[in-house]
């Protein structure tokens, strides 16, 4: 009778095992082992027992001990089970960004691994098991579908293999794939809202605001603002699920014409874009030309208003005749015209909008001096010892200097509060003088003494 020890062995792939073949008869004609594995016999005393070292065991094998005794031939098999963990545990590649609400199929592929009966494939989200299945086929494939939720953002999905050899007295061998980090996002179907001037003047700055609600995660949204080829540099402020991107846009004469303003929001692998046209125009303020800004009374003055060739002007509220970019008026300068404003208003239509520009010039009329009865009375009668304020106003431009002297030596304190004395009585010569000339006027002060009352 032939026997083998051990009758069952589990060993790692490529490992070695000692197998003892024994027979019950004392003098066997033959005792050996039949195996394709590399073997080495260990020398032992006696004839009825042999020990072999079987090496480089790569797969399950059933070496067979045999013996030939006088009472006949017999055999005994030992069962070698090879174990090894999978060579590849991999999640099928997926885009890292996934829109919320999409069904996401996770596919795990496992190559190798034995014994397959003890090999299980587990799909996980973090530490939570999503699916557990035995490894079947080569490569083994396990799939599961996940409905992408907002709270999955940043979650790690992985695949784990478990080779459970604990029933065989060994341990549980685990292999885990590289994790797949899921980035979830929500990009609404509505395009971003773009607020900007429809028209923009050359050499000015405009403000462009692009905003969108209902984004997740809002901090990951990329905003691209551009006017034509000019990339804008916005300042972005974020809300819980919204953003607002504000940028200043400067335009020059080179940008004149119709330009395309774009706002693109990129989140995950999706984008939303809004386009708008902006008309860039040049419209200098109209020019108000006075023949001379400062003239003497009685001078003929021409006031001209000139504007952009396509503009329509009004000068002091009067439209140009015919309606167009030029207007003019003529006047003879009077003192009342001093300080008079000549205002030219120009209107230009740009992309359906009316743009208004104004320019104002002031006329200075030099006149005078003047001294008249109304502002410089010729006669004052005041009681002695009373408090009085002599008033005499000279008019003119420039404002004349005024002095009132009695006998060429005594000044009358114009505009000052004086105590009336007999010294104040008399006739004063008031002289108003400016660069425009000189006028004189006599003013008499009468003092009423108490004895005359």
């Amino acid at each position: 009778q032939t026997s083998v020890s051990p009758s069952k062995v589990i060993l790692p792939r490529g490992g070695s095992v000692l197998v003892t073949c024994s027979t019950s008869c004392d003098q066997p004609k033959l005792l050996g082992i039949e195996t394709p594995l590399p073997k080495k016999e260990l020398l032992l005393p006696g004839n009825n027992r042999k020990v072999y070292e079987l090496s480089n065991v790569q797969e399950d094998s059933q070496p067979m001990c045999y013996s030939n005794c006088p009472d006949g031939q017999s055999t005994a098999k030992t069962f070698l089970t090879v174990y090894w963990t999978p060579e590849r545990v991999e999640l099928a590649p997926l885009p890292s960004w996934q829109p919320v609400g999409k069904n996401l199929t996770l596919r795990c592929q496992v190559e190798g691994g034995a014994p397959r009966a003890n090999l299980t494939v587990v799909l996980l989200r973090g530490e939570k098991e999503l699916k557990r299945e035995p490894a079947v086929g080569e490569p083994a494939e396990v799939t599961t579908t996940v409905l992408v939720r907002r709270d999955h953002h940043g979650a790690n999905f992985s695949c784990r293999t478990e080779l459970d050899l604990r029933p065989q007295g060994l341990e549980l061998f685990e292999n885990t794939s590289a994790p797949y980090q899921l980035q979830t996002f929500v990009l609404p179907a509505t395009p971003p809202q773009l607020v900007s001037p429809r028209v923009l003047e050359v050499d000015t700055q405009g403000t462009v605001v692009c905003s969108l609600d209902g984004l997740f995660p809002v901090s990951e949204a990329q905003v691209h603002l551009a006017l034509g080829d000019q990339r804008l540099n916005p300042t972005v402020t974020y809300g819980n699920d919204s953003f607002s991107a504000k940028a200043s846009v400067s335009v020059t004469a080179e940008d004149e014409g119709t330009q395309r303003l774009t706002c693109a929001v990129i989140l995950g692998n999706q984008s939303q874009e809004t386009l708008q046209t902006v008309t860039i125009y040049s419209f200098p303020a109209p020019n108000v030309i006075l023949t001379k800004p400062e003239v003497s009374e009685g001078t003929e003055v021409t006031v001209k208003c000139e504007a952009h060739p396509r503009a329509k002007v009004t000068l002091n509220g009067v439209p140009a005749q015919p309606l167009g970019p030029r207007a003019q008026l003529l006047l003879k300068a009077t003192p009342e015209d001093n300080g008079r404003s000549f205002s030219c208003s120009a209107t230009l239509e740009v992309a359906g909008q009316l743009i208004h520009k104004n320019q104002t010039r002031e006329l200075r009329v030099l006149y005078g001096p003047r001294l008249d009865e109304r502002d410089c009375p010729g006669n004052w009668t005041w009681p002695e010892n009373s408090q009085q304020t002599p008033m005499c106003q000279a008019w003119g431009n420039p404002l004349p200097e005024l002095k009132c002297l009695k006998d060429g030596t005594f000044p009358l304190p114009i505009g000052e509060s004086v105590t009336v004395t007999r010294d104040l009585e008399g006739t004063y010569l008031c002289r108003a003088r400016s660069t425009q000339g000189e006028v004189t006027r006599k003013v008499t002060v009468n003092v009423l003494s108490p004895r005359y009352e």
Epitope: E401, K403, D407, G408, T409, F410, P411, E416, D423, R433
Partner: antibody
Amino acid sequence: EVQVLESGGGLVQPGGSLRLSCAVSGFSLSSHAMGWVRQAPGKGLEWIGIIGSSDRTYYASWAKGRFTISKDNSKNTVYLQINSPRAEDTAVYYCVRDPYDSYDEGYRLWGQGTLVTVSS
Amino acid sequence: DIQMTQSPSTLSASVGDRVTITCQASQSIYRYLSWYQQKPGKAPKFLIYDASKLASGVPSRFSGSGSGTEFTLTISSVQPDDFATYYCQQAYSSGSIDNAFGGGTKVEIK
């Protein structure tokens, strides 16, 4: 050009009489007042008096009686008569255009002055 | 009678100093006050009229202020050419007066 030029100064004996002249040009005496100011050696300015455009005269209280201001519009000349000069009348005498004429800004127009020395 | 009182009578200053001279009238002369500068052997030079108006050609470091009875002449930064005697003169009344001028202030080098 507006100018004033004093003359008539020099050495005079106490108790005698002296008349200083002031010739003006560039303006009319009929419309301007003219005054006299003196300055004793090492002393301050002292106002003597003024003749108005109407020929009326005004004097400092100490000058009344011994000092007389007059003018001749046709000759465009103003005069200062000093009666009974005393040693304390020794001074430089300035003829000045009115103290506050319109636009002429106070004693703006001064002559170069004429020195009167009262000594026996 | 209107009397004019000037102070101080003498004032010592260094080049660059700020100098202030005051003039007081015994009754209101409104703004009818002039200031003069006189150097030895020369006729007085007109500086300021109407209390604060600068006569033509006068440097802007000179300024005048005041009205009524109190007046001030200020030299913001005294220059070597400014060492002289300064007089105020009232130009309001030519009647019943002793002297239209203040007693003078001599500004000398410290």
